[in-house]
């Protein structure tokens, strides 16, 4: 989806464990720590020397909804995400570097602690470089590792 164009289940045992309020997670990982604004995320990334992962999405976008579910249920992604400063946005920031090839959703962009947008860490779609689909979780996981690995080699 291009945001410039338009913007009752029974519980199973594992659902009974206490969940944190969704607020900032918006369902992308209720057990993770999420930042509220891009500015805060940049500050935390710089001061903690951890890469930032920015997820752009929309509540009313089927592909955002679908990616959110697999992201939140993917144990390895959720574990690896603990090593990032995390931000999910349902609006566009004024920083054009976060939309290198357009303002579509869902898209995931990595920023390193030097505040450089990692435009080189891309998905598999040539027309939407930072888009991921539910079938792309392995690639997303690898890209997260790449962001962490490259960060370590740059220290």
């Amino acid at each position: 989806k291009d945001t410039t164009v338009k913007s009752g289940a029974k519980k199973d045992p594992k659902d009974s464990r206490p969940k944190l309020p969704q607020t900032l997670s918006r369902g992308w990982g209720d057990q993770l720590i999420w930042t509220q604004t891009y500015e805060e995320a940049l500050y935390r990334s710089k001061t903690s020397n951890r890469p930032l992962m920015v997820i752009h999405h929309l509540d009313e976008c089927p592909h955002s909804q679908a990616l959110k579910k697999v992201f939140a249920e993917h144990k390895e992604i959720q574990k690896l995400a603990e090593q990032f400063v995390l931000l999910n946005l349902v609006y566009e920031t004024t920083d054009k570097h976060l939309s290198p090839d357009g303002q579509y959703v869902p898209r995931i962009v990595f920023v390193d602690p030097s505040l450089t947008v990692r435009a080189d860490i891309t998905g598999r779609y040539s027309n939407r470089l930072y888009a991921y689909e539910p079938s792309d979780t392995a690639l997303l996981y690898d890209n997260m590792k790449k962001a962490l690995k490259l960060l370590k080699t740059e220290l």
Partner: antibody, heavy 120, light 107 residues
């Protein structure tokens, strides 16, 4: 193999409600979206809405939003579509259709359909 | 809502013919388009998703192409069992919307 088995035909009076079930097997129930689609006699296909059985999240076609409720029962791997305030124009075959196996939105497998007739 | 305009609404072709059905979206839907085959009294069957990906078990004579607003379903060599109505579906945006259908008959 994947199977979606729907409940039998229903005849309802105008103003009544109907609840159609779709019992699934052969895949991880909680991790695929389930869509509902209807087809009036001799007409095309119309999307009603979808539900994620894992947590019950739904999205409805605005045309049906006030009258339709989708639910899921993980203990029986069954999804339900309830349509209220029935009118004659709701006479149609109602299909459940599973999303992609990996959680993708595309419709992959279809139930056999349930004919709902609304008549006084 | 996104409108899906399918054409032709019906066609008649001979066994072995190449058959092409088109679907046009009222706005860009990327590649989020599926094609379905429906025979009388039966549930639809999914043939293609993401514009050009063939569903497992579907004969290779079926293919899909296109992106953005214009999409095509091609049957390279029409077989008697292909007699059915074909529908496209956009799933880029809520509500998902179907084309009006194309009825394929044998000459």
């Amino acid at each position: 193999q994947v199977q979606l088995v729907q409940s039998g035909a229903e005849v309802k009076k105008p103003g009544a409600s109907v609840k159609v079930s779709c019992k699934t097997s052969g895949y991880v129930f909680s991790r695929s979206w389930m869509n509902w689609v209807r087809q009036a006699p001799g007409q095309g296909l119309e999307w009603i809405g979808w539900i994620y059985p894992g947590d019950g999240d739904t999205n409805y076609n605005g045309k049906f939003k006030d009258r339709v409720t989708l639910t899921a029962d993980k203990s029986t791997s069954t999804v339900y579509m309830e349509l209220s305030s029935l009118r004659s124009e709701d006479t149609a075959v109602y299909f459940c259709a599973r999303g992609g196996y990996d959680g993708s939105p595309w419709l992959s497998y279809w139930g056999q359909g349930t004919l709902v007739t609304v008549s006084s | 809502d996104i409108q899906m305009t399918q054409s032709p609404s019906s066609l008649s072709a001979s066994v072995g013919d190449r058959v092409t059905i088109t679907c046009k979206a009222s706005q860009d839907i990327n590649s989020y388009l599926s094609w379905f085959q429906q025979k009388p009294g039966k549930a639809p069957k999914t043939l293609i998703y993401r514009a050009n990906r063939l569903v497992d078990g579907v004969p290779s004579r079926f293919s899909g192409s296109g992106s953005g607003q214009d999409f095509t379903l091609t049957i390279s060599s029409l077989q008697p069992e292909d007699i059915a109505t074909y529908y496209c579906l956009q799933y880029d945006e809520f509500p998902f919307t179907f084309g009006g259908g194309t009825k394929v008959e044998i000459k």
